[in-house]
């Protein structure tokens, strides 16, 4: 049997199930996530669920650029230090940078000092480059 | 009043060289990224190469790529565009063009009146 | 890839034209789109960045739109006046290079 891999939108890429959509506009969190979601697909900004996971997306960004964080779906929305991802996946896998987690950041982004394998948290209303997820 | 000057443009032979400048007043020149954009006689615009705001990292188009040097002097709020090995296919009006941040790919919101460079033997 | 712009428009006085920018590939929607007049003899002049924004100044009979499903940009002209005579260029960038369209020439009948 021929097992055909499922197609993504013009511009995104597959990896292991889903299709993923770099967007280099700049967004607050919640207006990226709008964005994500007007797609259709149960797309949302990405969570990202493995070191594998991580490595292939920030394989992808790096060949866009290597300074600019970008917005993913890890959000603290009772701001008190419980992250959860807007698509509703478990937060299991965990790849903050050593930074301190404090102030008003309730939001969490790629960070490019790492070559986006880790993650910081910033304030929501900052805009932006975002990444959407979805599973075809 | 915010403005962009061009200079430097003129008839080379095949071969040759020129420098470009970009005189630029009435903002902070350092705060943004800066272009050269070409229009060859009766065609359409194109991107020639872009300098980020600092300096630190310049970007080409692969038409010139290894023949055509940008680079910014801060301090003299002046853009250049050094063209070696010039062909007749870089024959065009140059426009000097402003980013509207400090990184290079954003719109183009301010514009100068341009310079001619003709690639003729 | 490469943006696609129709050749020409007519449309006469007071009219709405519509013109449209299509990326050949990777998605329109991921990178911002501007559009830029320029009248015969002039320099270029930004009149829509980051896909509807207009600077001030710009008219508001000029507006601009992204459709994902169609993978273009496009922008609207409406209440046309002689002085929007001239060529429109769409542009947008991907992987450290700028992009234009190959321009749109719009005439006032």
């Known amino acids: 049997d021929i097992i055909m891999r499922p197609s993504c939108a013009p511009g995104w890429f597959y990896h292991k199930s889903n299709c993923y959509g770099y967007f280099r506009k700049l967004r607050n969190w919640s207006d990226a996530e709008l964005e994500c979601q007007s797609y259709g697909n149960g797309a949302h900004l990405a969570s990202i669920l493995s070191l594998k996971e991580a490595s292939t997306i920030a394989e992808y960004i790096s060949g866009y650029q290597r300074s600019q964080p970008i917005w993913i779906g890890l959000h603290d929305p009772q701001k008190r230090q419980q992250w959860q991802w807007i698509d509703g996946a478990m937060y299991l896998y965990r790849s903050w940078s050593g930074k301190s987690m404090g102030g008003n950041k309730h939001c969490a982004e790629m960070s490019s000092n790492n070559n986006f394998l880790t993650w910081s948290s910033n304030e929501c209303n900052k805009r932006q480059h975002f990444l959407c997820k979805y599973r075809p | 009043e915010v403005q962009l000057l061009e200079s430097g443009g003129g008839l080379v032979q095949p071969g040759g060289s020129l420098r470009l400048s970009c005189a630029a007043s009435?903002?902070?020149?350092?705060?943004?990224?800066m272009s050269w954009v070409r229009q060859a006689p009766g065609k359409g615009l194109e991107w020639v190469s872009a300098i980020s705001g600092s300096g630190g990292s310049t970007y080409y188009a692969d038409s010139v790529k290894g023949r055509f040097t940008i680079s910014r002097d801060n301090s003299k709020n002046t853009l250049y565009l050094q063209m070696n090995s010039l062909r007749a296919e870089d024959t065009a009006v140059y426009y000097c063009?402003?980013?509207?941040?400090?990184?290079?790919?954003?719109?183009?919101?301010?514009w100068g009146r341009g310079t001619t460079v003709t690639v003729s033997s | 890839f490469m943006l696609t712009q129709p050749h020409s428009v007519s449309e006469s006085p007071g009219k709405t034209v519509t013109l449209s920018c299509t990326r050949s590939s990777g998605s329109i929607s991921f990178d911002y789109v501007q559009w830029y007049q320029q009248r015969p003899g002039s320099s270029p002049i930004l009149v829509i960045f980051e896909d509807d924004q207009r600077p001030s100044g710009v008219p508001d009979r000029f507006s601009g739109s992204i459709d994902s499903t169609s993978n273009s940009a496009s922008l609207t002209i409406s209440g046309l006046q002689s002085e929007d005579e001239g060529d429109y260029y769409c542009?947008?960038?991907?992987?450290?290079?700028?992009?234009f369209g190959g321009g749109t020439k719009v005439t006032v009948l």
């Open positions: 063009a402003r980013g509207a941040g400090a990184t290079p790919f954003n719109a183009f919101d301010i």
């Open positions: 009435g903002f902070t020149f350092s705060s943004y990224a």
């Open positions: 542009q947008t960038y991907d992987d450290n290079r700028q992009v």
